[in-house]
């Protein structure tokens, strides 16, 4: 075109409806200048105007031919176009605000505004542009895009940003524009135009200086402190540390904590100083509640149910911005709320929750919430599966007689529908407890009963119990513990009985021994002695406990010695000994040796020994009768180890081992022995019977029993030259090789002669007995042998 | 570890000078504002000196106000008191602490004794 | 400047006893009041800040209160290690200053 006629023809839209239309006049003409504008397309149109724009309906694809006649004072003339949507601008109104709105306590702006859709034909997505500033010096903060979509009708959008910084610190300015990305458009497309701009600032009260106030934050966020001030602001300080000042409008400051470390209880101290003051805040730095670990429900008494639980990791976060725990139960709806002041037992919370009538199984969700965030636990429970009664109360023992008795206690609950399982512990004095289990249907009034048989009588038991619902899920807590003595019965068994005659042969003495505690069934208060023959039976006094002994004048027929044990409730059967033995021609004393505490018996069985073997022991060294103490076994035994406090090594015993039939006793072997031997303590006294030139005749007497110490194995008997004080060695010295030793094995020799000697000649005679326990002391003798005739 | 330590006291007569030297260690010394406080024998304790973490503020007692000067070095971790015009009255142990406002770690303290 | 005052100036107590010291500021200082403690022959030590803000590491027995110009540190069951001088100091402008000091001793 000419630059006499129209020129820069350009098209814009902003609804993709409408297209406007404008080119520039040309050069030298005035105001007064008409314009026809033809449009070449199925329907030719003109249009007459006076300005230098039009707005055209949108054309369909496709070139069309434009044709401008410009008509002044001095001409007019022409110019022609092609236009083709392709050279169509797609430029949006201008957006506008239509609402701007801060949330001060969480540092949000929110902002509303409309797209206008309405003037759109069809369906675009539009990206929108959102600048946020800040300060009076409008620095740019941030730009984001916002996506939408036209839909045929005008819409209102709404967005919301938060700010690091609070805005309280600084005035925020907001501003949008918007670009139509439409599909059914070929043309080029713009963005619009930045809306006006709108604000937000703070009204400053007189109180609050530092913002944001008690601040509670995930521990490693970043958080903006600032500090409105009018004076200037000299420092600031997280803390017991400075941190840089960051300038804003005026005297206002603030300061940036990058990866903020936990608070301690009273929370972080953030300051900001002036010339003549301190302005503060706290901000607290916490975490977000942990899932809470162990969750567990469970009841002591079906009426209320028990829930406890670990909080898991510390929160950092006390009294107002601690957790705080909901215990909801999902199938009743019905919730209970954890209560502050419920401070934790051992790092566990817990949490009463009252039983519905009728609900077995609970379906429970502990939720945790802090103002940082929430977590939760759930668990499903059948409550009759977890019981954990309560210890039981009032425990008492009542008799029912000497080998049962009536116990009785308090579990607190309703437990009408389920069974329970108690334990209860009897523990005799000095024996290892027993444990019985016992089932018992649960009861509505918390009372429980149970007998417990197979006591023994006149036992002293510690009783306690313990029970868990037969499902079991924890035993309760031991109940205290009762001591109770059993009553007493009838003894069980008469005492072991033996007789002795006396020395004289006139008397016998019967022994017997105190009934075991479990045999005597009570207190023992007098035996009753009998004797009796085919033709008469005759009954001594009573004798009192604790005499365990009696003496009958008896002729030597023979009796049946009847023993009977009384207590408050009876007497026991008889136990029953003849007096008279049961003659035995074939015996041998025996030697036995112990092995340091016992000694051991062994003897072949014997079917005719029908009620008992007795061993009978004393010190071989005392005077008749001969009785230290007595041990009875049964009729099938072939052996027992004899034990007793009272023996000691080197101390000789005789045993006794009797066979017993009808009563009767019948003297099987007799030994003698020692528990231990030992060497003797003394030497044999010898002396020289006969001296000639050439040999010596020793003899010696025995060693006493008691300085035996064991039994005597033979003598050792040693000779050499040698002179009394006299330097030359002594004959048991080492070393000397004319020393000689004879051995004398035969301990019934008690001489010996010493051959082969030479004629006065001093020899050192030395002699000693030997024991299995060693050798014995020396003896010894100086002899001069004769000259040689 | 975390420490202060102090230099630099000794004996030295009155109208004399003294340079005090402070070595931090074991924390961030830039970040902090740091003092000088001291104590007179058998006394209480007596603020002397503060100067700003980076160095931009320094504010002193009316005691030594004129006379004392207090620098900090970031790059050496080290703060400084320089004492002029000594008096018998300055004779105190001088220690140097961390923390503008309230004073969280202390120096073992280093005796200067004015006197003649 | 702001005074502060500390009284007692000595302290006579046994191990297990409550103490409490008193710090008074000639003007208000709000809550910016720390508390230090020394041993013989030792530098200070911070106790307490902010008036009853605990020092990390400082055992809880120890225990601050007070705003404005009336203050007190309290130490609810003395222990053989609390025997020592405990100073008061304001920190609400420059100069800082000491209270005169308050030594606990032993009964």
């Known amino acids: 075109q000419k630059k006499g006629a129209p020129h820069d023809l350009k098209c814009v839209t902003n609804n993709l409806q409408v297209w406007d239309c404008y080119w520039k006049a040309p050069s030298g003409t005035g105001r007064g200048t008409d314009y026809e504008v033809c449009i070449e397309n199925r329907s030719h149109s003109c249009y007459q105007l006076e300005k230098t724009n039009i707005k055209i309906p949108a054309l369909s694809h496709g070139d069309y031919e434009i044709t401008i006649n410009s008509l002044h004072d001095f001409g007019s003339s022409t110019s022609k176009f092609t236009l083709n949507e392709q050279n169509v601008s797609l430029i949006p109104d201008t957006p506008e605000i239509l609402n701007l709105s801060a949330d001060f306590s969480t540092s949000t702006l929110y902002l509303k505004w409309n797209d206008r859709g309405s003037v759109f034909p069809h369906h675009s997505n539009v990206i929108w542009e959102i600048k946020i500033l800040r300060k009076e010096s409008m620095e740019l903060v941030k730009l984001v895009t916002h996506n939408t979509t036209l839909n045929g009708k005008d819409t209102l959008h709404h967005w919301s940003w938060a700010s690091d910084m609070p805005l309280e610190c600084a005035i925020h300015f907001v501003e949008i524009r918007c670009y139509i990305d439409s599909l059914h458009f070929s043309g080029r497309k713009e963005w619009s135009d930045w809306s006006p701009v709108k604000n937000i600032s703070w009204m400053p009260d007189s109180q609050t200086k530092v913002f944001p106030q008690d601040k509670v934050i995930l521990v490693g966020s970043d958080i903006t402190f600032c500090c409105i001030s009018q004076e200037k602001v000299l420092s600031a300080l997280i803390g017991h540390t400075n941190c840089p000042l960051i300038h804003l409008d005026g005297e206002n400051v603030a300061i940036k904590i990058h990866n903020i470390s936990v608070s301690a209880s009273s929370g972080t101290n953030v300051v900001f100083t002036t010339e003549d003051n301190i302005f503060g805040t706290v901000i607290f730095a916490g975490y977000p509640p942990d899932t809470p670990q162990q969750l567990n429900c469970e009841t002591h008494d079906l009426k209320e149910i028990l829930c406890r639980w670990n909080p898991g990791r510390a929160t950092a976060l006390v009294g107002p911005r601690a957790t705080s725990y909901t215990l909801l139960e999902s199938f009743s709806g019905k919730y209970v709320r954890f209560k502050r002041a419920e401070a934790p037992t051992n790092g566990s919370y817990q949490l009463f929750f009252q039983m519905l009538p009728n609900q077995e199984i609970y379906n429970f969700t502990l939720n945790a919430h802090n103002p940082l965030g929430r977590s939760e636990s759930t668990i499903l429970v059948n409550i009759t599966e977890k019981v954990y009664p309560h210890t039981p109360t009032s425990f008492k023992v009542k008799d029912i007689n000497s080998t049962a008795v009536k116990l009785s206690w308090h579990l607190p609950g309703n437990f009408a529908k389920i069974n329970f399982l108690c334990q209860i512990e009897i523990k005799k004095s000095n024996t290892v407890q027993e444990q019985r289990n016992v089932t018992i249907k649960g009861v509505e009034n918390s009372s429980y009963l149970v007998a417990l048989d197979k006591l023994n009588p006149y036992t002293v038991y510690t009783f306690r119990i313990r029970c868990s619902t037969e499902t079991f899920w924890k035993w309760s807590k031991w109940s205290n513990k009762k001591q109770h003595l059993t009553t007493e019965a009838i003894p069980s068994k008469g005492p072991d009985t033996w007789r002795e005659w006396s020395s004289d042969g006139k008397n016998l003495i019967i022994y017997w021994k105190p009934l075991p505690i479990n045999e005597a069934n009570g207190k023992i208060l007098s035996y009753n002695v009998s004797c009796s023959s085919d033709e008469e039976t005759q009954s001594l006094s009573e004798i009192p406990d604790p005499q365990h002994k009696a003496e009958i004048q008896l002729d030597k027929n023979d009796y049946i010695i009847s023993v009977v044990a009384k207590n408050s409730v009876g007497s026991s059967p008889p136990s029953k000994i003849a007096s008279m033995e049961i003659p035995n021609d074939d015996l041998k004393i025996e030697q036995v040796v112990g092995m340091g505490k016992g000694i051991l018996l062994t003897w072949h069985y014997d079917p005719n020994m029908t009620c008992d073997y007795v061993i009978k022991w004393c010190n071989s060294s005392r005077s008749e009768p001969c009785l230290m103490d007595w041990r009875k076994v049964p009729s099938n035994s072939t052996e027992t180890v004899i034990e007793s406090d009272q023996f000691r090594p080197g101390v000789r015993y005789n045993f006794f081992l009797y066979g017993c039939r009808n009563q009767g006793y019948q003297l099987l072997r007799s030994m003698i022995g020692y528990i231990e031997e030992l060497a003797p303590t003394v030497a044999p006294n010898f002396t020289v019977e006969d001296t000639s030139a050439d040999s010596i005749l020793v003899k010696w007497e025995d060693i006493p029993v008691e300085e035996l110490r064991g039994f005597l194995r033979g003598y050792l008997f040693y000779f050499g030259k040698g002179e009394r004080d006299t330097s030359k060695m002594r004959v048991l010295e080492s070393g000397r090789s004319d020393i000689k030793v004879k051995n004398i094995t035969d301990i019934s020799q008690k001489t010996l002669r010493i051959a082969d000697l030479q004629g006065k000649t001093s020899y050192h005679l030395v002699l000693r007995a030997y024991t299995d326990g060693g050798v014995g002391p020396e003896k010894s003798m100086y002899v001069v042998t004769k000259e040689n005739s | 570890q975390v420490q202060l330590v102090e230099s630099g006291g000794g004996v030295v007569q009155p109208g004399r000078s003294l340079r005090l030297s402070c070595a931090a260690s074991g924390f961030t010394f830039s970040s902090y504002g740091m003092h000088w406080v001291r104590q007179a024998p058998g006394k209480g304790l007596e603020w002397v000196a503060v100067?700003?973490?980076?160095?931009?503020?320094?504010y002193y007692a009316d005691s030594v106000k004129g006379r004392f000067a207090i620098s900090r070095d970031n790059s050496k971790n080290t703060l400084y008191l320089q004492m002029n015009s000594l008096r018998a009255e300055d004779t105190a142990i001088f220690y140097c602490?961390?923390?503008?406002?309230?004073?969280?770690?202390w120096g073992r303290g280093t005796l200067v004794t004015v006197s003649s | 400047d702001i005074q502060m005052t500390q009284s007692p100036s000595t302290l006579s107590a046994s191990v297990g006893d409550r103490v409490t010291i008193t710090c008074r500021a000639s003007?208000?200082?709000?809550?910016?009041l720390a508390w230090y403690q020394q041993k013989p022959g030792k530098a200070p030590n911070l106790l307490m800040y902010k008036a009853s803000n605990l020092e990390s590491g400082v055992p809880s027995r120890f225990s601050g209160s007070g705003s404005g110009t009336e203050f007190t540190l309290t130490i609810t069951s003395l222990q053989p290690d609390d025997f020592a001088s405990y100073y008061c100091?304001?920190?609400?402008?420059?100069?800082?200053?000491f209270g005169g000091g308050t030594k606990v001793e032993i009964k």
């Open positions: 003007q208000s200082i709000s809550s910016w």
């Open positions: 100067i700003w973490f980076d160095g931009s503020l320094k």
């Open positions: 100091q304001q920190y609400k402008s420059n100069p800082l200053t």
């Open positions: 602490a961390r923390g503008q406002l309230v004073q969280d770690l």
